[in-house]
């Protein structure tokens, strides 16, 4: 058993049929010695008397809010949550495995630039009685500060018969140095509680590996005289790190016909313009990637050829 926060405790249980559970001793936070009784979840049933209560915690029915009273007055509370361990592995019932980029990926994170600001998100099919807390640091042995906001419900989707809920959180490294080579990874820790079940999830990454630029902006076409060719031009996204001479992007320009089966023409360039042939009913798309480090490509910015 360990204290999650004041008056909230997590009991770690090996979870298998007929498991013995954990013996837990609760102490009433009071100078009183006599006439103390204990109840669980405001039930009228008295579980025991005295300053301490010893319980055997085996299942969720044994978790909850234990209250000690004297003469009808509440003296203190202890909330017990359960953290299940099955076959030596902590349970991951609350969050959904996103399976990208690999199995057992529960948290996914992205950064639009090198400022030290990043967003993480996770998925669940649980709609209610669910809470999260997010902490982060750079490194774990001598951690440097990262400040995270509150996790919020950011999207709801219907997946077959199930509803899926996406939660997200924004974090900012307190003393970020965008141009510095990272040697220690960012650690993100998410505590999750559903009713009386506690779970925790972690992710570890370098900002450089989670970079995904915003799409190029101001994508424009300029027809070239007496030619089927057009000059495509665009700009760096506003959210990308500056100066662009140091934080450089490379671009992929694609001409795509109306039909997905049509052959795509692709051009790669470090410039912010390119000359391509604009076919009828086609569209031109441009996406960006860090020029010197192969992290994710941005989403496409697109304009129709006509």
């Amino acid at each position: 058993i360990w204290e999650l926060k004041k008056d909230v405790y997590v009991v770690e249980l090996d979870w298998y049929p007929d498991a013995p559970g954990e013996m837990v001793v609760l102490t009433c936070d009071t100078p009183e010695e006599d006439g103390i009784t204990w109840t669980l979840d405001q039930s009228s049933e008295v579980l025991g008397s005295g300053k301490t209560l010893t319980i055997q915690v085996k299942e969720f029915g044994d978790a909850g809010q234990y209250t000690c009273h004297k003469g009808g007055e509440v003296l203190s509370h202890s909330l017990l949550l359960l953290h299940k361990k099955e076959d030596g592995i902590w349970s991951t019932d609350i969050l959904k495995d996103q399976k990208e980029p690999k199995n057992k990926t529960f948290l996914r994170c992205e950064a639009k630039n090198y400022s030290g600001r990043f967003t993480c998100w996770w998925l669940t099919t649980i709609s209610t009685d669910l809470t999260f807390s997010v902490k982060s640091s750079r490194g774990s042995s001598d951690p440097q500060g990262v400040t995270c906001g509150a996790a919020t419900l950011s999207a709801e989707r219907v997946r077959g018969d199930n509803k899926e809920y996406e939660y997200s959180v924004e974090c900012q490294e307190d003393s970020a140095c965008p141009a510095a080579e990272e040697s220690l990874p960012i650690e993100v820790m998410v505590d999750a509680v559903h009713k009386l079940k506690y779970e925790n999830y972690t992710s570890s990454f370098f900002i450089r590996d989670i970079i995904k630029p915003d799409p190029p902006k101001n994508l424009q076409l300029k027809p070239l005289k007496n030619s089927r060719q057009v000059e495509v031009s665009w700009e760096y996204p506003d959210t990308w790190s500056t100066p662009h001479s140091y934080f450089s992007l490379t671009f992929c320009v694609q001409v795509q016909g109306k039909s997905k089966r049509e052959k795509k023409d692709r051009v790669f360039t470090d410039k912010t313009s390119a000359t391509v042939i604009c076919r009828k009913n086609a569209s031109i798309s441009v996406r960006a990637q860090d020029r010197y480090y192969s992290s994710s490509w941005s989403e496409w910015a697109s304009v129709p050829c006509s």
Partner: nanobody, 119 residues
Framework: EVQLVESGGGLVQPGGSLRLSCAAS?????THWMYWVRQAPGKGLEW???????????????YYSDSVKGRFTISRDNAKNTLYLQMNGLKPEDTALYYC????????KGQGTQVTVSS
């Protein structure tokens, strides 16, 4: 066994106020989202407000239906296992049986308390 007992309803004039209470027992109140729902005469159940409490951060969030936003305030006292609904600027269309519930569809609810808004 889950018990939800509502109180505080009554007859009030338009523009008046009432405060409803719901005493909860038989479950861990602080880890549950709690709801007020209502049923007007001859109508179905309508969601009114939600209170979520984050035991990890100690923060409460509240959500309201458009019909009561700005007039009603949901709150909770986890130490007393009690949910409240402060209703101001009451209108005749707020007349209904008000239930405290443990889910938004009202499957797990109390016996209700009647609110009548009439001059």
């Amino acid at each position: 066994e889950v018990q939800l007992v509502e109180s505080g309803g009554g007859l009030v004039q338009p523009g008046g106020s009432l405060r409803l209470s719901c005493a909860a027992s038989g479950f861990t109140f602080s880890t549950h989202w709690m709801y007020w729902v209502r049923q007007a005469p001859g109508k179905g159940l309508e969601w009114v407000a939600t209170s979520t409490f984050n035991i990890l951060t100690g923060t409460e969030n509240t959500y309201y239906s458009d019909s009561v936003k700005g007039r009603f305030t949901i709150s909770r006292d986890n130490a007393k296992n009690t949910l409240y609904l402060q209703m101001n600027g009451l209108k005749p269309e707020d007349t209904a049986l008000y239930y405290c519930a443990r889910d938004s569809s009202g499957n797990l609810k109390g016996q209700g308390t009647q609110v009548t808004v009439s001059s």
